[in-house]
């Protein structure tokens, strides 16, 4: 018979033959042959593989480094990685939670809608028209543009979400 060019799900093609993939939690020791099945071995104590695979090495579980404020939220198994979270009152810097911050700052152009608490991080909001923020801050709201009119001045440069308006003297030239 013709050698296969594609294999079924949970199989892989090697040496013109379809071999079974190793199940999650196990790594490949040797490919199948015409006479033998794929040989797989369970991952070690601090290792995992989370897919049907033909990997010859398992992945190391993530280390939740206490020096970065991390602790274990969910212990890894042979099929799942360890999930880290931050110590109480601290917040993950990313979805992968590789480090912790006390709270995040809102970038220029954004103001603080809600200051961080022990359970929720800083909530930022974009500065609407008429308001600006030119700093990175974990407490400052968007500031209103300066009103040139109330100072008997005129707008020389329009404001943006990151900059205040620039006021200047009125043109007093007469025709």
């Amino acid at each position: 018979p013709e050698p296969p060019t594609a294999c079924r799900e949970k199989q892989y093609l090697i040496n013109s033959q379809c071999c079974s993939l190793c199940q999650p939690g196990q790594k490949l020791v040797s490919d199948c042959t015409e006479f033998t099945e794929t040989e797989c071995l369970p991952c070690g104590e601090s290792e995992f593989l989370d897919t049907w695979n033909r990997e010859t090495h398992c992945h190391q579980h993530k280390y939740c480094d206490p020096n970065l404020g991390l602790r274990v939220q969910q212990k890894g198994t042979s099929e799942t990685d360890t999930i880290c979270t931050c110590e109480e009152g601290w917040h993950c810097t990313s979805e992968a939670c590789e480090s912790c911050v006390l709270h995040r700052s809102c970038s220029p152009g954004f103001g603080v809608k809600q200051i961080a608490t022990g359970v929720s991080d800083t909530i930022c909001e974009p500065c609407p028209v008429g308001f600006f923020s030119n700093v990175s801050s974990a407490f400052e709201k968007c500031h209103p543009w300066t009103s040139c009119e109330t100072k008997d001045l005129v707008v020389q440069q329009a404001g943006t979400n990151k900059t205040d308006v620039v006021c200047g003297p009125q043109d007093r030239l007469r025709a």
């Epitope: 020096n67 110590e87 810097t93 407490f139 400052e140």
Partner: nanobody, 116 residues
Framework: EVQLLESGGGLVQPGGSLRLSCAAS???????EMWWVRQAPGKGLERVS?????????YYADSVKGRFTISRDDSKNTLYLQMNSLRAEDTAVYYC?????????WGQGTLVTVSS
């Protein structure tokens, strides 16, 4: 990288005053937003006060408004917290923090105990 060292804590009677200092070494605090945060025994972190990089804007938690004053002296690379009319509920370890507020910038804190 910046190291922050808090000092000035101690035992004080209710109604008394203390001035906490936070001295930075290894890097400047100039231009950086700074915070005071506290942790009472068996409680979570509470954000007490903050000051903008320019020193022009400040924030105070409702629980300390009118009693605490935050200030900075960039020439001395030091942040301060003047605490007046102290109450038993102000008892906590006080920490300072500098933007970007990462865990490895965290100081050891200074213990404030308010008791008669």
């Amino acid at each position: 990288e910046v190291q922050l060292l808090e000092s000035g804590g101690g035992l004080v009677q209710p109604g008394g005053s203390l001035r906490l200092s936070c001295a930075a070494s290894g890097s400047t605090i100039a231009g950086y937003e700074m915070w005071w945060v506290r942790q009472a025994p068996g409680k979570g972190l509470e954000r007490v006060s903050a000051i903008s990089g320019s020193g022009g804007s400040t924030y105070y938690a409702d629980s300390v408004k009118g009693r605490f004053t935050i200030s900075r002296d960039d020439s001395k690379n030091t942040l301060y917290l003047q605490m007046n009319s102290l109450r038993a509920e102000d008892t906590a370890v006080y920490y300072c923090a500098r933007d970007p507020y990462s865990f490895d910038y965290w100081g050891q804190g200074t213990l404030v105990t308010v008791s008669s």
